[in-house]
């Protein structure tokens, strides 16, 4: 419960604080959890234990591990634990997902980007600001305290932000990078009632007997993000799980976002195996939200083999 | 075996609200649609809405939205349907209803009367 | 909307008599139609779903049949318990219609 993930870059700074939490008057104790050794509070070491701080100035692959810190008042202990991972310096732009931290939402009106965990450095302005690894310039842009403020934000502008900073210890001075995703919030979205868009209303759908089949159930529900939208397949007028036929499943499809704004959802509806009796079911792709529900109806009709002459 | 018990009648003035429960027992709560129905008297049967007890999403018929809000208890697998702003043309008997296949209503609440008299 | 349009709006028959009752929606529906009888006083009563499928519990004597937009109930050999008002509801599309019923009278 008392654990706490933090993350760094070889060769750059990398600050810790114990998860317990305490007066400042208590001590802390810092172990390496493996060997059960004590980390020392010497500022000379690289790393070092500071109260409730631990740093790596600078961190190293091998400084990876649990550090268990112990906080020690007149009547108790309490121990937390920081899992520590170092990463190599990654050659190219991309920053993986184990790097990143949480995403962060904007919108027309707001859009603060904090710089993560950079409270437990001592760093001083100007911070910088990198958006996938471009240097960020411009007057839409400024780099205010701890956070970057963008003016008049569009949907271009989600992305992964890196703030870089240096942070200073008795003159020396350490680099420290973070990122986060920034996400943007559509203000002017609306929903409306369900519109499927696949498969066209009392379709047939040709299939092979004993092949595999696919029906996909598309509908769109407005712009921006939908509140209790969902899409889903009906078989004789039952639930698909309902229906218990384990040839027959369905699977969730891709979250769409059109170009136009419009948000979608597919569900795909898969038949193993094709058997006669399928063509005797009524498949129905089910499209609710808040305003009503509709459906559209699908049959499947035999495909006839077609000869193949050279 | 399934059961869908309702509150009792009310008389109410216009302008008021009323809020009709339906507990339902017999059955997993959470597995199906219930519906709203009503009929005023001498009347045929119209279609309020429905309420998802998993999910708590409603969809109600355009000429009660904004005055009909469903809720869900799960705790007590109760549903409740709520008209505000009643008038004298909203006197009729409330039904809840159980979803089954196709979405027709296979198990009915007894009914309760709410009566909107000045 | 979907409209629903049962005809006719009443009847006369006797014991033993055949009865069709007609339901036409203003859009196909496919088979999502279901009937229901109802007594006065008392709450519907489910008899066919999906428009041809009878309900557990419910007598031989009623059926359904139909697909798309016109729909019919059926009762072979009408009993002194089925003397009720008949509804057809669609469920394809929000909001789920009724018919304005038909009343099955003793003649």
């Known amino acids: 419960k008392f654990s706490k993930q933090s993350w760094g870059l070889e060769n750059e700074a990398l600050i810790v604080r114990c998860p317990r939490q305490g007066k400042p008057s208590y001590t802390v104790d810092w172990y390496y959890s493996q060997t059960n050794k004590s980390i020392p509070t010497q500022e000379r070491n690289r790393v070092f234990a500071s109260g409730q701080l631990l740093k790596f100035l600078p961190a190293a692959v091998a400084d990876s591990g649990i550090y268990t810190c112990i906080v020690r008042s007149p009547t108790f202990n309490r121990t937390g634990y920081a899992n520590v991972t170092i990463y190599k310096k990654q050659s190219d732009c991309n920053v993986p997902d184990y790097l990143m931290y949480s995403t962060v939402s904007g919108s027309e009106k707001n859009s603060k980007i904090y710089c993560p965990t950079i409270d437990l450095y001592n760093w001083t302005a100007p911070l910088e600001w990198f958006k996938n690894c471009q240097a960020l310039q411009g007057s839409r842009y400024r780099a205010h305290k701890s956070f970057l403020v963008i003016d008049n934000v569009m949907t271009e502008d989600a992305g992964d932000y890196t703030c870089k900073f240096i942070h200073n210890e008795n003159g020396a001075n350490y680099s420290v990078t973070a990122t986060r995703s920034f996400t943007v919030k559509d203000e002017q979205g609306f929903s409306l009632f369900p519109v499927i868009g696949a498969p066209a209303q009392n379709e047939i759908k040709e299939v092979e007997i004993g092949k595999n089949a696919n029906l996909t159930c598309s509908a769109c529900f407005g712009k921006g993000t939908q509140f209790l939208a969902a899409v889903l397949w009906q078989l004789n007028g039952t639930k698909i799980t309902d229906f218990g036929e384990p040839r027959i499943q369905q699977e969730e499809g891709q979250n769409q976002s059109f170009s136009n704004g419009l948000a979608c959802l597919d569900m795909v509806l898969r038949i193993a195996d094709v058997k006669e009796e399928d063509l005797l079911l009524q498949y129905d792709c089910l499209a609710l939200n808040l305003h009503g529900l509709r459906r559209h109806t699908v049959r499947l009709s035999r495909k006839n083999p077609i000869d193949h002459h050279s | 075996q399934v059961q869908l018990v309702q509150s009792g009648a009310e008389v109410k003035k216009p302008g008021a609200s009323v809020k009709v429960s339906c507990k339902a027992s017999?059955?997993?709560?959470?597995?199906?649609?219930m519906f709203w129905v009503r009929q005023a008297p001498g009347q045929g049967l119209e279609w309020v809405g429905l309420?998802?007890?998993?999910?708590?999403?409603?969809i109600f018929a355009q000429k009660f939205q904004g005055r009909v809000t469903m809720t869900r208890d799960t705790s007590t697998s109760t549903v409740y349907m709520e008209l505000s702003s009643l008038r004298s043309e909203d006197t009729a008997v409330y039904y809840c209803?159980?979803?089954?296949?196709?979405?027709?209503?296979?198990?009915w609440g007894q009914g309760t009367l709410v009566t909107v008299s000045s | 909307d979907i409209q629903m349009t049962q005809s006719p709006s009443s009847l006369s028959a006797s014991v033993g008599d055949r009865v069709t009752i007609t339901c036409r929606a203003s859009?196909?529906?496919?088979?999502?139609l279901a009937w229901y009888q109802q007594k006065p006083g008392k709450a519907p009563k489910l008899l066919i779903y999906?428009?041809?499928s009878l309900q557990s519990g419910v007598p031989s004597r009623f059926s359904g049949s139909g697909s798309g937009t016109d729909f019919t109930l059926t009762i072979s050999s009408l009993q002194p318990e089925d003397f009720a008002t008949y509804y057809c509801?669609?469920?394809?599309?929000?909001?789920?219609?009724f018919g304005q019923g038909t009343k099955v009278e003793i003649k």
């Open positions: 209803a159980r979803s089954s296949d196709y979405d027709s209503s296979d198990y």
């Open positions: 017999g059955y997993t709560f959470t597995d199906s649609f």
């Open positions: 309420i998802n007890p998993g999910t708590g999403a409603t």
């Open positions: 859009q196909s529906i496919s088979t999502w």
């Open positions: 999906g428009a041809s």
């Open positions: 509801q669609q469920s394809y599309n929000s909001p789920y219609t």
